[in-house]
């Protein structure tokens, strides 16, 4: 069964910078990736980036750079200019489409131990979901 993994990582050098890494585990080629974010329990979500293997990428603030890492994984750099606890309680979701097979989504958030005062980010743990 295809699966999607998501890692959310705080940059060690800049506490207001985050990176979301997402990947697809399964057969087939990726036709589109959509990254979205919002509050817990599906509240107040919106798109951050859309990546098409041929047509390119589009991103919306606070996304800084969306890019393909491999043919089946992407990364999205985020810049937070807000409060002292950046992206706290924020859920990031990645949805990979493989046409015509189907599409799969998984979501993740910054691990609770990611205190802005830490000198280095924690090791991100993949979150897997197969619906």
């Amino acid at each position: 069964t295809p699966e999607v993994w998501v890692q959310v990582q705080m940059e060690a050098t800049e506490l207001s910078s985050f990176t979301v890494h997402c990947g697809f585990l399964g057969p087939g080629s990726i036709s589109l990736v959509t990254v979205s974010w919002g509050g817990p329990d599906g509240a107040g979500g919106t798109k951050l980036a859309v990546l098409h293997p041929e047509l390119g990428t589009r991103q919306w603030a606070p996304a800084r750079q969306a890019r393909w890492e491999t043919q089946s994984s992407i990364s999205l750099a985020l810049e937070d200019s807000g409060a002292s606890s950046p992206f706290a309680n924020t859920t990031f979701c990645c949805k990979f489409a493989s046409f015509p097979e189907g599409s799969w989504e998984s979501c993740g958030s910054l691990p609770p131990s990611s205190d802005p005062g830490l000198s280095a980010p924690p090791t991100p743990v993949p979150i897997l979901r197969a619906d």
Epitope: T34, G38, K47, V50, K95, A97, P100, S103, W104
Partner: nanobody, 127 residues
Framework: EVQLVESGGGLVQPGGSLRLSCAAS????????MSWVRQAPGKGLEWVST????????SYVDSVKGRFTISRDNSKNTLYLQMNSLRAEDTAVYYC????????????????????WGQGTMVTVSS
């Protein structure tokens, strides 16, 4: 796995109304823009309407403006298309899709350019 299941299609007389529904599962529906696209017999895929994630912004192709209304109920994970004053030229298979084709300014659409897609529901407008 993401699933989008359309319903509500059928045969209707010109001037009549139909309400299409799209039940979504397997993803965080409330985070995503959703659209309706259609494919008339022997024609290519045509964008019909898009609604943003919270339902606050909608857009329509000129040919359906004032006749069709897109809406969503995020608490029910459902997308709707209310179609009034139907015309013969509205006859098509209607697909519920995740995404907004305007992201890339697509002129010739394909279902593969969307993040998720349903199996479609047939709407026939005929007397």
């Amino acid at each position: 796995e993401v699933q989008l299941v359309e319903s509500g299609g059928g045969l209707v007389q010109p001037g009549g109304s139909l309400r299409l529904s799209c039940a979504a599962s397997g993803f965080t529906f409330s985070y995503y823009d959703m659209s309706w696209v259609r494919q008339a017999p022997g024609k290519g895929l045509e964008w019909v309407s898009t609604i943003n994630s919270d339902g606050g912004r909608t857009s329509y192709v000129d040919s359906v403006k004032g006749r069709f209304t897109i809406s969503r109920d995020n608490s029910k994970n459902t997308l709707y298309l209310q179609m009034n004053s139907l015309r013969a030229e509205d006859t098509a298979v209607y697909y519920c899709v995740e995404g907004d084709p305007h992201n890339f300014g697509l002129e010739s659409l394909s279902l593969r350019d969307f993040g998720s897609w349903g199996q479609g529901t047939m709407v026939t407008v005929s007397s």
